[in-house]
């Protein structure tokens, strides 16, 4: 049994990281292989993951961690029964993968306005509360190619497009992702998307 | 091995307060976040209040803010509870339990808020 | 707040039984969710965390599946030591919160 993609891990600098890897050839990774990872201070204790399949030969693990700092480091050991299959280190702050925003909603009241609004997925004292970027989603479910990208690169939550932007008359559907630039983060996974009715008043045109 | 090991519950008055305490052993204390959780008699979990490792950062349930307050000696390895206008519906065994996501659990101290 | 919502509340089941309790969030958790055992008089133990990764030690007839608002655990085969009460938690963010639980009797 060899390690065919060596271990990476994402961290939601919070309180999961995930590693993934793929043996040489079909594994049941619940069964036949644990992860031991341990922050690298004195008096640590060393904990077990048992991962998950992914795929035929692919397998993927959730550490549980403490509220990360950024100068946390932690080992890592990939065992087979009492075969070392691999030996790592792995920094979460240098591989974030933020979480994703939540609570999606479209505000369809304000006058010839779409106000989006959304959750920061942190809470308030974590670093990246007050770093996160988001990129919007918006596209129709008639038409494949209306499909537009809006980047909110303030720290408040929420963007306000016109509704004339978009089209009359028929359904959109919007989601949204973070990503904090100050860590070099990936993309976060895309929120559930929320849908709606897009409908404004046509300007009155004079002759 | 890690134990936690709560104390200072008793029986008060409504109104009253009571100061919980938890001392944490067999783990580097510093290096952990804490919270408290409750359970009233026959009732189920209630998550109290957190104490983060990393910011001081603290969190409360709506149910016990503005009366309780969480706070951490790293240098005595303890964890406690400040519990001020106490009432009936506070009645609970208190458990201090570490995180991540309440691995390890004291086995509780009992709170009685009776007249 | 995240509202968490278990069922059933209580049930009764016989050894050897496949046992299936559920929790609804109120919003999207992701899979920021983990399952409590509690016996009586005796402190709860995590069985699950992440919603499907399970926890060290923990016999693997037990297995958790769900992710945003819709969350299952299964015991595959129940035995005699499984009954007791069983508690999912959500800490995608505070307040934390529990189900109101869901206590596996015999039947």
């Known amino acids: 049994m060899k390690v065919l993609q060596e271990p990476t891990c994402v961290s939601d600098y919070m309180s999961i990281s995930t590693c993934e890897w793929k043996m040489n050839g079909p594994t049941n990774c619940s069964t036949e292989l644990r992860l031991l990872y341990q922050l690298v201070f004195l008096l640590s204790e060393a904990h077990t993951c048992i991962p998950e399949n992914n795929g035929g030969a692919g397998c993927v693990c959730h550490l549980l961690m403490d509220d990360v700092v950024s100068a946390d480091n932690y080992t890592l050991d990939l065992w087979a029964g009492q075969q070392l299959l691999w030996k790592g280190s792995f920094k979460p702050s240098e591989h974030v993968k933020p979480r994703a925003p939540g609570n999606l909603t479209v505000h369809t009241n304000v006058s010839d306005t779409l106000l989006l609004t959304w959750s920061n997925p942190y809470p308030p004292d974590n670093y990246l509360y007050n770093h996160l970027t988001y990129a919007v989603n918006i596209w129709s479910e008639n038409d494949p190619a209306d499909f537009r990208i809006y980047n909110v690169t303030y720290l408040e939550p929420s963007l306000r497009i016109a509704a004339s932007t978009l089209k009359s008359g028929i359904s959109y559907r919007a989601r949204v992702r973070a990503w904090a630039r100050c860590y070099n983060t990936t993309w976060s996974e895309w929120s559930p998307s929320t849908k709606w009715h897009n409908s404004y008043r046509e300007p009155f045109e004079q002759h | 091995q890690v134990q936690l090991v709560e104390s200072g519950g008793g029986l008060v008055q409504p109104g009253g307060s009571l100061r919980l305490s938890c001392v944490a052993s067999?783990?580097?204390?510093?290096?952990?976040?804490m919270n408290w959780v409750r359970q009233a008699p026959g009732k189920g979990l209630e998550w109290v209040s957190y104490?983060?490792?990393?910011?001081?950062?603290?969190y409360y349930a709506d149910s016990v803010k503005g009366r309780f307050t969480i706070s951490r000696d790293n240098a005595k390895n303890s964890l406690y509870l400040q519990m001020n206008s106490l009432r009936d519906e506070d009645t609970a065994v208190y458990y201090c339990a570490r995180e991540p996501v309440f691995d390890y659990w004291g086995q509780g101290t009992l709170v009685t808020v009776s007249s | 707040d995240i509202q968490m919502t278990q069922s059933p509340s209580a049930m009764s089941a016989s050894v050897g039984d496949r046992v299936t309790i559920t929790c609804r969030a109120s919003?999207?958790?992701?899979?920021?969710l983990a399952w409590f055992q509690q016996k009586p008089g005796k402190v709860p133990t995590r069985l699950i965390y992440?919603?499907?990764s399970l926890q060290s030690g923990v016999p693997s007839r037990f297995s958790g599946s769900g992710s945003g608002t819709e969350f299952t655990l299964t015991i595959s085969s129940l035995q005699p030591e499984d009954f007791a009460t069983y508690y999912c938690?959500?800490?995608?963010?505070?307040?934390?919160?529990f189900g109101q639980g869901t206590k596996v009797e015999i039947k």
């Open positions: 919003q999207d958790i992701s899979n920021y």
């Open positions: 104490i983060s490792r990393a910011t001081g950062a603290v």
């Open positions: 067999g783990f580097t204390f510093s290096h952990s976040s």
């Open positions: 992440a919603a499907s």
């Open positions: 938690l959500q800490w995608s963010s505070y307040p934390r919160t």
